[in-house]
């Protein structure tokens, strides 16, 4: 096709691809009608003057994953139609001034994964049509003022994975069309007030994996179109009360891996579009009332791996659309019976790895759509009667690694587990911790010959202990699941405790080590 070099493949669609370690210079002659040229995985170390002079129709040029360390200023002369230029994954340390001169049509410039030490305003001063500039994965330590001043049409700028320690508040001031700004994996310790003020069309701001300790109160106040804000893995210890106040379009906010100790009510919002909030790996110790009340559309709230020991009953007010709540690996000992009452659409709740000693009987009373509950590795000895009875969609319940007390009071839980087993995951079985003669034995195969109470007391109406989807109605209106009177009233009040008689001889039980936990 108009003379395709032997080291390359050329297609009818005017696409040329030259690959292989044997290539040490730009192959010639290149087809004059080439519109796309890819030079990949070669041993080319430098680009001399005008190697692409005769292919002026070129629109896309990818010179990636080579040994390229030096480029002559006139290397891209005569490529006035070029719209896409990638020099990514090479060994460039320096860009010659004027390298991109004459590339009047250039829209995408990829310089990522090189060894660039600095950029200067003159580098991009001719690239007035540039929309995308990728500089991530270099060795940049600072960005001089004016570096991007001529890139008024830029919509995407990636400066991630460099060595930036500070950002001038003026460096982005002319980028009014910028939609994506990525500064992740640098060494930024703070962002000056006003740094993002000119970015009125910004939709994504990635600041994760820096060393930011403090956020200025008005840092994001001009970014009304921001949709995704990544602040994870920094050193943020507190959030100024108004820092997120002007972000009505935000739908994703990550704050995990910081040093947050507390969250004040109203800190988030109003953010009517926020769908996910990631707060794990912080030092949060308590959640006050209404702390998330502005997040009406939140679907995922991740609060795991903190130090939460107290959750106010109204902490989750307003989260009517929440689907997933992760509270695992905290320091919870008790939960208020109403704490999840507002979470009518909750599907998955993770409470494992806490210190929960008991659960209120009405803890899941209004959360009828729950599909998964993780309660493993707590201090639970038993669960209230009927706690799961109304959860017709539950298909994963994890209860192992708790010190279950296998006396007669465990029978309702044991029966519930047995009668509902086809709907539950085949996870590790709950194992008895006490009394001593049943320790290590499976809760669902303990011997259940229960002694009769010596004094007959009329039974108090209890929570119905029915399996899911019973074939006949399981609880009449008189025993409503949300009835707090029933939750607090004892089920049976015998004068002597009934106990489960169990043989402690493992060989008689035929227990394997796996079964005995």
């Amino acid at each position: 096709y108009h003379g395709c070099p032997s080291e390359c493949t050329c297609s009818r669609a005017s696409q040329v691809e030259c690959t292989g370690a044997r290539i040490v210079a730009v192959p010639t002659p290149l087809p004059w009608n080439a519109m796309s040229l890819q030079i990949l995985n070669t041993h080319i170390t430098e680009l001399n003057e005008s190697p692409f002079l005769n292919i002026s129709a070129l629109i896309a040029l990818r010179i990636e994953k080579n040994e390229l360390s030096r480029i002559t200023p006139g290397a891209f002369r005569n490529l006035g139609s070029l719209r896409y230029l990638s020099l990514a994954n090479n060994k460039l340390q320096v860009l010659p001034i004027g390298l991109f001169q004459g590339l009047d049509s250039l829209e995408s410039l990829l310089l990522s994964s090189n060894q660039l030490l600095q950029i200067q305003p003159a580098h991009f001063s001719q690239c007035s049509n540039l929309k995308e500039l990728q500089l991530h994965g270099n060795h940049l330590e600072y960005i001089p003022d004016g570096a991007f001043d001529h890139l008024v049409g830029l919509t995407k700028l990636n400066l991630g994975k460099n060595s930036l320690t500070h950002i001038s508040p003026r460096v982005f001031q002319h980028l009014g069309n910028l939609q994506v700004l990525r500064l992740y994996e640098n060494r930024l310790t703070d962002i000056p007030m006003g740094t993002f003020d000119g970015l009125v069309n910004l939709q994504e701001l990635a600041l994760q994996q820096n060393q930011i300790g403090l956020l200025s109160p008005g840092l994001f106040h001009n970014n009304h179109n921001l949709q995704r804000l990544y602040l994870s893995n920094n050193h943020i210890s507190q959030l100024p009360p108004s820092v997120f106040m002007q972000l009505p379009q935000l739908n994703r906010l990550t704050l995990f891996g910081n040093s947050l100790k507390e969250l004040s009510p109203g800190i988030f919002g109003p953010m009517p579009n926020l769908r996910e909030l990631w707060l794990y790996d912080n030092h949060i110790s308590s959640l006050p009332d209404n702390v998330f009340s502005n997040l009406r559309q939140l679907q995922v709230l991740i609060l795991s791996r903190n130090q939460i020991s107290f959750i106010s009953p109204g902490a989750f007010n307003g989260l009517t659309e929440l689907r997933e709540l992760s509270l695992h690996t905290n320091a919870l000992q008790d939960l208020d019976g109403n704490v999840f009452r507002m979470l009518a659409n909750l599907q998955n709740i993770s409470l494992q790895n806490n210190r929960l000693r008991q659960l209120p009987g009405n803890i899941f009373a209004n959360v009828n759509g729950l599909m998964a509950i993780q309660l493993q590795n707590n201090q639970l000895e038993n669960l209230p009667l009927g706690i799961f009875d109304h959860l017709g969609k539950l298909c994963e319940l994890r209860l192992y690694d708790n010190p279950w007390r296998c006396d007669s009071d465990i029978l309702p839980l044991r029966n519930w587990l047995l009668l509902n087993q086809p709907r539950l995951g085949t996870d590790t079985v709950p194992v008895c911790f006490s009394p001593a003669n049943v320790r290590g034995q499976s809760l669902i195969i303990i011997n259940v010959n229960v002694a009769v109470p010596s004094v007959h007391v009329p039974e108090v109406p209890s929570y119905p202990e029915t399996p899911w989807y019973p074939d006949t109605p399981s609880y009449p209106d008189t025993t409503s699941v949300s009835s707090t009177t029933e939750l607090t009233s004892p089920v049976e009040d015998y004068t002597d405790l009934t106990t489960i008689q169990v043989t402690d001889d493992r060989s008689v039980w035929g227990m394997t080590q796996a079964q005995s936990g």
Epitope: S408, N415, Q421, S442, I444, N449, V452
Partner: antibody, heavy 113, light 111 residues
Framework: QVQLQQSGPELVKPGASVKMSCKAS????????IHWVKQMPGQGLEWISY??????KYNERFRGRATLTSDKSSSTAYMELNSLTSEDSAVYYC????????WGQGTTLTVSS | DIVLTQSPASLAVSLGQRATISCRAS??????????MNWFQQKPGQPPKLLIY???NQGSGVPARFSGSGSGTDFSLNIHPMEEDDTAMYFC?????????FGGGTRLEIK
């Protein structure tokens, strides 16, 4: 000790209904499942249904013809069978707990015109 | 429904010897790492009696000569040593899922 005392034998006509009982003693009635099992003369065992605190599960083969109820005050479980045919002639057992650890002595039902 | 197939249909064993009855399920009866297979003994004119539950756990008051083993789909009941009193029908039963089903039975007698 745990006991399940079932009602006496029944002789009924085809198309009629019967209600048999199973009175539990020696344990807390509400803490255990009660199953009902059918055994035709000289044949195997067939699970019908269970009841636990008013919730029931049925074998599809008996749904609509068997109805389980219980009276907690007297620790008694009941099974009613309707639209009886000669195929329903059998011994009907009640049994306690998920694992059927104690059984009643059985109620013999004869359906004959 | 889970179908349980017992074998043999009848078995004669000498006193003091070992009797082995097998039960194969049409699908696994395991859950939570536990096999929900139970064994019952029934003598003429009497209700069944629970011998073994969850594959290998003895019912209350059941002599130690009765033992159960197996997992997944294949299970067995062992009686050793065989005694006169062990002449009866033996049924396996799965309680993994509704409808709970029984095997067809094995008649065990003294040789």
């Amino acid at each position: 000790q745990v006991q399940l005392q079932q009602s006496g034998p029944e002789l009924v006509k085809p198309g009629a209904s019967v209600k048999m009982s199973c009175k539990a003693s020696g344990y807390t009635f509400t803490s255990f499942v009660i199953h009902w099992v059918k055994q035709m003369p000289g044949q195997g065992l067939e699970w019908i249904s269970y009841i636990y605190n008013d919730g029931t599960k049925y074998n599809e083969r008996f749904r609509g013809r068997a109805t389980l109820t219980s009276d907690k005050s007297s620790s008694t479980a009941y099974m009613e069978l309707n639209s009886l045919t000669s195929e329903d002639s059998a011994v009907y057992y009640c049994a306690r707990d998920y694992y059927f650890d104690y059984w009643g002595q059985g109620t013999t039902l004869t359906v004959s015109s | 429904d889970i179908v349980l197939t017992q074998s043999p249909a009848s078995l004669a064993v000498s006193l003091g010897q070992r009797a082995t009855i097998s039960c194969r399920a049409s699908e696994s009866v395991d859950y939570y790492g536990i096999s929900f297979m139970n064994w019952f003994q029934q003598k003429p004119g009497q209700p069944p009696k629970l011998l073994i539950y969850a594959a290998s756990n003895q019912g209350s008051g059941v002599p130690a000569r009765f033992s159960g083993s197996g997992s997944g789909t294949d299970f067995s009941l062992n009686i050793h040593p065989m005694e006169e009193d062990d002449t009866a029908m033996y049924f396996c039963q799965q309680s993994k899922e509704v409808p709970y089903t029984f095997g067809g039975g094995t008649r065990l007698e003294i040789k």
